[in-house]
Interface confidence: low
């Protein structure tokens, strides 16, 4: 069937359109185009005779039409009047007519739209704003954009006038946005420049900052007020209802209790004509006195006296706080607080209770601290120590002994030799000593405040000959692979060389052997059973030398994994079973046996006469060393065969 296709169907003014013919019959005489839906000679555009290839313009020809041999019609420089139907009249060679009608629509190219507004400064929650998209254009579709998004669904938004007008009812500050309109028709789409809606709002209820309402006397009061408002609000301050100033900030230096009261900020928007106020109540507190500590005993004696510390002044309905060494009070049965926390009692003071102590008074705003107080605890003297620790000296050297005892106040010292007072000094010095200076040297420490005295006695031997040394040990029964042993060669003597021997040989080089204290101490780390040897120490100086008696180290070890003998595991029925268990251990271990898990006897040897196949099973030997606390075991399987079935041993 003959059809007409318009390309394009929607044509912009000034452009061109092609009326394309489909299914054109063969054997044609010619064809003619008409404006309209029917063949009307008065509205003929152009006729075409194929045989002569002659095109003849008709009454409706505008000079913008071109006809093609395939009957298609091109219309150029389209105008609005070209809209409508076009009919092709085909005359076949047999002069039979055929008609087809096509159509197209002409639309103008749209201009760039603009937005007009009926209210450039609408007031929030009061005004409505109507935006209109200009110009009004026929056959155009109007669209709206808010912040480049399509319109949100809202009962406050209404489109009218064929969507050309957008009305925002009861505008809010949130409607402050970028608005654009767009015009569309089938051939073009144009978007307007954005219009920013300037909504007048507020002032909202102002906020006063900072939020705190409590101040101390002497501080500066600096209040700032802010209210959301467009245009920005004008601010006024009132104190207790009296106007102060028209500023956003209120500053009062060095406030007093008299500045307490209600502070009102008023925000005014000259465009909306609205006022909003916010009130804050400011309380100014008087500065409390700085606390201080009094004590009922300024020089308490250790382990005797109690001390009561009191926080002054006494103020009713006040919270008292205490700190020791800059920390809150530790839990201790020796610390007691009074009901009001004002008095802290230290029962039976010690030298560690010196402090410092602080008390505090808590008020509405902060905690005021006292100055720290330190206790002067009287203690000691402790047992004095005499140094150096040498007990043997050679004639001709100088003897210089020093005495010290922990004490508060510091101790007074006295020296006695063989019970006779020598001098009241902390140090005792005797030059060029002889054997006659041997004796008992006593240091006496005295605390004048507590009246206590303590003494220490040291035996000093002055001799050219060195004494026979002896070995002391810090562990007489060390455990293998666990303990260390420190041997010390006694006595400690001045200008003396210390030597060591093991089993009569000089010390082997070993990372487990360490000499210290001027070679006077020999330490064996991680002892092993091989360290159970004879140890001898020697001392020598330029005049004499001497050796100690040997000391044998008794290393506890084991039990090692036991061995069951004989090794056989197959026996003939009727034989005697005689199993012996042995484990290396010091001291000797305790033995026990289990057969198939059942405890048997606590002996080293297990004997069973005339065994049978019933004695088949697992035989376990358990060993235990009570000194090392260690245990061990071994399991052996025994098979008993009926006589004659397999070779075996008989006991």
């Amino acid at each position: 069937k003959l059809t007409i296709e318009s390309t394009p169907f929607n044509v912009a003014e000034g452009k061109e359109v092609l009326l394309l013919v489909h299914n054109l019959p063969q054997h044609l005489f010619g064809y003619s185009w008409y404006k309209g839906e029917r063949v009307d000679g008065n509205r003929q555009i152009i006729g075409y005779v194929i045989g002569t290839q002659q095109a003849t313009p008709g009454p409706a020809y505008s000079g913008r039409e071109i006809i093609y041999p395939n009957a298609s019609l091109l219309i150029q420089n389209i105008i609005q009047n070209d809209t409508g139907f076009y009919t092709l009249h085909v005359i076949k060679s047999d002069l039979v007519n055929e008609e087809a009608t096509g159509q197209f629509r002409v639309y103008p190219e749209l201009p760039k739209p603009s937005i007009s507004s009926n209210n450039s400064k609408p007031v929030e929650d009061k005004d409505a704003v109507a935006f209109t998209c200009e110009p009004e254009t026929q056959d155009a579709t109007y669209l709206w954009w808010v912040n480049n998004q399509s319109l949100p669904v809202s009962p406050r938004l209404q489109l009218s006038n064929g969507n050309r007008t957008l009305t925002l009812f009861n505008v809010t500050r949130n409607d402050t946005a970028s608005y654009k309109c767009e015009t569309q028709n089938p051939v073009s789409a144009r978007r307007s420049d954005s219009v920013i809606l300037n909504v007048l709002y507020g002032p909202d209820a102002p906020t006063i900052s900072p939020l705190n309402t409590s101040y101390r006397s002497g501080e500066n009061l600096n209040l700032s007020c802010h209210a959301a408002s467009n245009p920005p609000a004008q601010y006024s301050w009132f104190v207790n209802g009296t106007f102060q100033q028209s500023t956003q900030e209120l500053f009062i230096p060095n406030i007093t209790v008299n500045n307490s009261g209600s502070y009102t900020c008023q925000a005014h928007n000259s465009d909306t004509g609205l006022n909003r106020t916010t009130v804050t109540t400011i309380t100014v507190y008087a500065e409390p006195p700085k606390p201080f500590i009094t004590s009922n005993n300024s020089n308490p004696v250790e382990d005797e006296d109690a001390v009561a510390l009191t926080c002054e002044p006494e103020i009713q309905n006040t919270t008292y706080l205490w700190w020791v060494n800059n920390q809150s009070l530790p839990v201790s049965p020796r610390l007691q607080l009074s009901n009001d926390n004002r008095t802290l009692t230290l029962l039976s003071v010690t030298r560690n209770d010196v402090g410092p102590y602080e008390c505090g008074i808590q008020n509405e705003l902060s905690v005021d601290h006292s100055d720290p107080v330190i206790l002067n605890v009287l203690y000691g003297p402790d047992d004095p120590t005499i140094s150096p620790s040498y007990t043997y000296y050679r004639p001709g050297v100088n003897l210089s002994l020093s005495c010290h005892a922990a004490s508060n106040p510091p101790a007074q010292y006295s020296w006695l030799i063989d019970g006779n007072i020598q001098q009241h000094t902390q140090e005792l010095f005797i030059s060029n000593i002889t054997e006659k200076n041997s004796g008992l040297y006593t240091c006496q420490a005295n605390n004048s405040a507590s009246g206590h005295s303590r003494t220490t006695v040291k035996t000093i031997t002055v001799s050219a000959e060195l004494p026979k040394p002896s070995i002391s040990s810090n562990n007489s029964k060390p455990v293998e692979d666990k303990d260390a042993v420190a041997f010390t060669c006694e006595p400690e003597a001045q200008n003396t060389t210390y030597l060591w021997w093991v089993n009569g040989q000089s010390l082997p080089v070993s990372p487990r052997l360490q000499l210290s204290n001027g070679n006077r101490t020999l330490t064996l780390f991680n002892v092993t059973r091989n360290d159970a040897r004879a140890y001898v120490c020697g001392i020598q100086n330029s005049v004499s030398a001497n050796r100690s008696d040997p000391v044998t180290l008794d290393v506890l070890y084991g039990p090692d994994t036991p061995i069951i003998s004989p090794p056989d595991s197959s026996y003939l029925s009727g034989a005697n079973l005689n199993l012996s268990c042995h484990s290396a251990s010091n001291p000797s271990p305790q033995y026990s046996w289990r057969i198939n898990g059942i405890p048997q006897q606590h002996t080293q040897v297990l004997f069973i006469a005339k065994i049978t196949p019933n004695n088949n099973g697992t035989y376990a030997c358990f060993v235990s060393n009570l000194a090392t606390g260690r245990n061990n075991s071994i399991v052996k399987s025994i098979t008993v065969s009926a006589s004659g079935t397999s070779p075996g041993l008989s006991a």
Epitope: V146, N147, Q149, P152, S154, P155, N174, A205, A228
Partner: antibody, heavy 121, light 111 residues
Framework: EVQLVESGGGLVQPGGSLRLSCAAS????????MHWVRQAPGKGLEWVGR????????KYADSVKGRFTISADTSKNTAYLQMNSLRAEDTAVYYC??????????????WGQGTTVTVSS | EIVLTQSPATLSLSPGERATLSCRAG??????????LHWYQQKPGQAPRLLIY???NRATGIPARFSGSGSGTDFTLTISSLEPEDFAVYYC?????????FGQGTKLEIK
């Protein structure tokens, strides 16, 4: 500190009336909208209505329109819910909640403890 | 009227697990890109308590394990690691337009 205390609930016969109060402290109700929300036993939350105490404008849910009236007394910082022609389906716990930029940032941030209304013959 | 649909109706989880609650609005509740959708928690015999306002803002005093997300019509409340005190009924509510509406609630119960 923001506080809301509802009162006035109780047992009432169908067709009867009740007046609920919502006393606010810690803020000025003029700065907010005051909403009423109810919760029937074992059910969810249902918005009843709201008032702008600054100008008295109010809005209502369809289910209570024409029967309930919301009012406010800014001098007492209190909102009210007058309930007339009560029905069994009005049985619920009634809450009041402020709503606005400064007090609740456009959400119902503060709620009273609720007052119970029982409509039964 | 904007209808809010919450899912699931009941959620059974154990303490320490992550909870995800959904709220779908019948139409967009955004005003210039901000969702006027809020989440509330309610325990038996107590008033509702605001958890999240305007989609994703945690209300004062609400622990950091609660978070909100979403815009337009789809919103989510997430509890990253459930504590025993979190088992309650959760409602979403919109203040986009009158009448204000709430979801039917999601009951979060101990598994």
């Amino acid at each position: 500190e923001v506080q809301l205390v509802e009162s006035g609930g109780g047992l009432v016969q169908p067709g009867g009336s009740l007046r609920l109060s919502c006393a606010a402290s810690g803020f000025n109700i003029k700065d907010t909208y005051m909403h009423w929300v109810r919760q029937a036993p074992g059910k969810g939350l249902e918005w009843v209505g709201r008032i702008d105490p600054a100008n008295g404008n109010s809005k209502y849910a369809d289910s209570v329109k024409g029967r309930f009236t919301i009012s406010a007394d800014t001098s007492k910082n209190t909102a009210y819910l007058q309930m007339n022609s009560l029905r069994a389906e009005d049985t619920a716990v009634y809450y009041c909640a402020p709503f606005g930029y400064y007090v609740s940032d456009y959400a119902m941030a503060y709620w009273g403890q609720g007052t119970t209304v029982t409509v039964s013959s | 009227e904007i209808v809010l649909t919450q899912s699931p109706a009941t959620l059974s989880l154990s303490p320490g697990e992550r909870a995800t609650l959904s709220c779908r609005a019948g139409e967009s509740v955004d005003i210039f890109g901000v969702g006027f959708l809020h989440w509330y928690q309610q325990k038996p015999g107590q008033a509702p308590r605001l958890l999240i306002y305007r989609g994703s803002n945690r209300a004062t005093g609400i622990p950091a394990r609660f978070s909100g997300s979403g815009s337009g019509t789809d919103f989510t409340l997430t509890i990253s690691s459930l504590e025993p005190e979190d088992f309650a009924v959760y409602y979403c509510g919109q203040t986009y337009e009158d009448p204000y509406t709430f979801g039917q609630g999601t009951k979060l119960e101990i598994k």
